[in-house]
């Protein structure tokens, strides 16, 4: 999906009002707060592409993020503020339902959510030069 035509300010507002709280909640109390940010993005469409991938695509060691509250709110924001996004997700969602297993949270999930926090922060500061 091409995120170029999304309403970025509306998505930013959704992030600031709710999604950010849920990400902080997920990470709260965690000792491993100093994860290295290995995923970066260069502009808002690119950031949303990376956010979508990390949030909804199961990875080795962390298959469970799509059911988290921050993920559901992310999905809702993208569906509302990115034209045509919902249609592209129907097949992906059906495929994921077939793969879903018992949720087990590991350090890999915590690391992944830490990466997501970095991507969202970058999304909110699009004019900053890439470090």
């Amino acid at each position: 999906y091409d995120f170029t035509n999304c309403d970025f300010e509306k998505i930013k507002a959704a992030y600031l009002s709710t999604i950010s709280k849920d990400l902080i909640t997920y990470m709260s109390g965690t000792k491993s707060t100093e994860f290295n940010n290995t995923v970066s993005c260069s502009n808002r469409p690119h950031c949303l592409t990376e956010i979508q991938s990390l949030t909804f695509n199961p990875t080795a060691g962390c298959a469970s993020l799509a059911k988290e509250m921050f993920a559901m709110k992310t999905k809702a924001a993208l569906a509302i503020w990115c034209p045509g996004y919902s249609e592209t997700q129907i097949n992906a969602t059906q495929a994921m339902k077939k793969r879903r297993k018992r949720k087990v949270t590991t350090n890999k999930c915590l690391e992944q959510v830490s990466q997501l926090q970095g991507l969202w922060r970058r999304f909110n500061r699009p004019l900053l030069k890439q470090q």
Partner: antibody
Framework: EVQLVESGGVVVQPGGSLRLSCAAS????????MHWVRQAPGKGLEWVSL????????YYADSVKGRFTISRDNSKNSLYMQMNSLRTEDSALYYC?????????????WGQGTTVTVSS | SSELTQDPAVSVALGQTVRITCQGD??????ASWYQQKPGQAPILVIS???NRPSGIPDRFSGSSSGNTASLTITGAQAEDEADYYC????????????FGGGTKLTVL
């Protein structure tokens, strides 16, 4: 003054139902996760359930899952626990406690508790 | 679910330093919180997260963590510190759940 006041604890027969309430005051209620924690007479603290700041997420200890339902009404600054299929081992002092969303699992304000007795 | 293990009872001489420990797999990943409870009273949070002391908690209370063990240290124990102390943290088997330790009864001699 930041305060939590529980109510609704009574004597009930095994298999019965009960609804506990917790009235919050002195803080912005919808900024906080809320928990129920119980303590049987002479025993330690046992976490029962939590509900996220916006009510979107609820979680339960295995011992009450499927029988208890936590909810909140942010417009009334109130937390609830619907308790069904009560067992004698549910007899305890039930506390509500608040947990900042940024420290979801630490409970920084507690009520004085309400007593639930399940007995025939 | 995970378990947190505490010594049932610990004693300390007035004015001395005592350490109360809490062990469990979840503490490798998550910080513990510590609560003080006196008879007939509700628990009070004394330490949260890394070593955060809520306002009103004396600075003789401190927290630390190493491996799978969290510790609550009271430096210069006072008579009013006699109480039950509980640790809790997120549950490592399901990080949305909460687990409490069994509690430690502290006696100040």
């Amino acid at each position: 003054e930041v305060q939590l006041v529980e109510s609704g604890g009574v004597v009930v027969q095994p298999g019965g139902s009960l609804r506990l309430s917790c009235a919050a005051s002195g803080f912005t209620f919808d900024d906080f996760t809320m928990h129920w924690v119980r303590q049987a007479p002479g025993k330690g603290l046992e976490w029962v359930s939590l509900i996220s700041w916006d009510g979107g997420s609820t979680y339960y200890a295995d011992s009450v899952k499927g029988r208890f339902t936590i909810s909140r009404d942010n417009s009334k600054n109130s937390l609830y626990m619907q308790m069904n299929s009560l067992r004698t081992e549910d007899s305890a002092l039930y506390y509500c406690a608040r947990g900042p969303y940024y420290y979801f699992y630490g409970m920084d304000v507690w009520g004085q508790g309400t007593t639930v007795t399940v007995s025939s | 679910s995970s378990e947190l293990t505490q010594d049932p009872a610990v004693s300390v001489a007035l004015g001395q330093t005592v350490r109360i420990t809490c062990q469990g797999d979840s503490l490798r990943t998550y910080y513990a919180s510590w609560y003080q409870q006196k008879p007939g009273q509700a628990p009070i949070l004394v330490i949260s997260d890394k070593n955060n002391r809520p306002s009103g908690i004396p600075d003789r209370f401190s927290g630390s963590s190493s491996g799978n063990t969290a510790s609550l240290t009271i430096t210069g124990a006072q008579a009013e510190d006699e109480a039950d102390y509980y640790c809790n943290s997120r549950d490592s088997s399901d990080n949305h759940l909460v687990v409490f330790g069994g509690g430690t009864k502290l006696t100040v001699l």
